[in-house]
């Protein structure tokens, strides 16, 4: 399987909410001995590999923001801890996997990574990740709503988030 990032860049005004999204592509094994671990973290475009460094999002580590379940089950993070920080990550039955950040500030700007681990309990872990940039802007040049930029080069027109 692979992870797709529908949008590679999110440009948002201060105070807005944004939902960063990743999507699982390809066949997903739903067997008893396969589970999925999904999480989010901040990173940098490191020398070794993008997303290899794991930094907290608003003081919450990737351990705090994880989802761990089987197949295409829906899941949510621990509500109280994440929501106290204006965060919520969720996963649906269709392979979509997101983190919502509320009341954005300039400090939220940076590179965000989603990590998906397919765990085959008697064999190995298979890791894939996706990366996207969040730019939070203030002042007269800031958009009125979040503007998202598709990852695929063939579809380069802007899409304004509802």
């Amino acid at each position: 399987f692979k992870v797709a990032t529908p949008y590679s860049l999110y440009v948002c005004p201060e105070g807005q909410n944004v939902t960063l999204t990743c999507r699982l592509l390809g066949p997903v094994d739903k067997g008893h001995d396969v589970t999925f671990y999904k999480t989010w973290y901040r990173s940098s475009r490191g020398e070794v590999q993008t997303c290899s460094e794991r930094r907290p999002i608003r003081n919450l580590t990737f351990q705090d923001l994880h989802l761990h379940h089987g197949g295409h089950q829906a899941a949510n993070t621990s509500h109280d801890l994440a929501q106290r920080h204006g965060l919520e990550s969720a996963s649906d039955h269709h392979g979509n996997f997101s983190i919502t950040m509320r009341n954005l500030t300039l400090l939220d700007s940076g590179l965000y990574c989603c990590l998906v681990v397919e765990i085959r309990h008697h064999h190995s872990e298979h890791r894939v990740h996706g990366a996207m940039e969040l730019q939070v802007q203030t002042g007269k040049d800031a958009p009125s709503n979040c503007v998202v930029y598709p990852s695929s080069s063939q579809d380069s027109e802007n899409i304004t988030a509802a």
Epitope: H32, D33, T35, Y37, Q63, H66, V117, E125, R127
Partner: antibody, heavy 117, light 107 residues
Framework: QVQLQESGPGLVKPSETLSLTCTVS????????WSWIRQPPGKGLEWIGY???????NYNPSLKSRVTISVDTSKSQFSLKLSSVTAADTAVYYC???????????WGQGTMVIVSS | EIVLTQSPATLSLSPGERATLSCRAS??????LAWYQQKPGQAPRLLIY???NRATGIPARFSGSGSGTDFTLTISSLEPEDFAVYYC?????????FGGGTKVEIK
């Protein structure tokens, strides 16, 4: 802050079954993997196996025929049973939280189990 | 299973010196390698994950490097509390395995 605490008898007779329990406090057991790791006196670390709260298990092939790991989410506990023990099973037994694509990030303090008649 | 070989078995150094510990895997583990520190009578403590990322609260004097089969843990300037046994551990496949350990002792 998540903490782990092992409990169980410190002395087991040869050919009997070693039984240990790990209690998870300060956090939910309903996520991650929960592992058992052992360390014979003066030697290195050996991973025994883990359980996911869903019940999925994974054991070290070298011990698989003798090991059972189970979980009781209502008590926030997971347990190890090792059958037909010999003196070679004498070790400090640790329980640990195992996060996928990460590491064993939280460990119990360990409990010494001696196999002797 | 993947065998991890650590060297040297014992490293005798003085406080303030640089310690370089090696871990070699019998086959590639990509960068899926962790390092732990264990002091007598205590459980291991996670230092490094994914070959070079420091775990939360670990001082900057600890650094990891390497990928594939050869890895290094470096302690830039040994503090008295750093004298301990260090283990590497792979998690590219199961069974999860540890190296035999390197003891860093006071010279």
């Amino acid at each position: 802050q998540v903490q782990l605490q092992e409990s169980g008898p410190g002395l087991v007779k040869p050919s009997e079954t070693l039984s240990l329990t790990c209690t998870v406090s300060g956090g939910s057991i309903s996520s991650y993997h929960w592992s058992w790791i052992r360390q014979p006196p003066g030697k290195g670390l050996e991973w025994i196996g883990y359980i996911h709260y869903s019940g999925s298990t994974n054991y070290n092939p070298s011990l698989k025929s003798r090991v059972t790991i189970s979980v009781d989410t209502s008590k926030s506990q997971f347990s190890l049973k090792l059958s037909s023990v010999t003196a070679a099973d004498t070790a400090v037994y640790y329980c640990a939280r195992d996060i996928p694509a990460f590491a064993f990030d939280i460990w119990g303090q360990g409990t010494m189990v001696i196999v002797s008649s | 299973e993947i065998v991890l070989t650590q060297s040297p078995a014992t490293l005798s150094l003085s406080p303030g010196e640089r310690a370089t510990l090696s871990c070699r895997a019998s086959q590639s583990v990509s960068y899926y390698l962790a390092w732990y520190q264990q002091k007598p009578g205590q459980a291991p403590r996670l230092l490094i994950y994914d070959a070079f990322n420091r775990a939360t609260g670990i001082p900057a004097r600890f650094s990891g490097s390497g990928s594939g089969t050869d890895f290094t843990l470096t302690i830039s300037s040994l503090e008295p509390e750093d004298f301990a046994v260090y283990y590497c551990q792979q998690r590219i496949n199961w069974p999860l395995t540890f190296g035999g350990g390197t003891k860093v002792e006071i010279k």
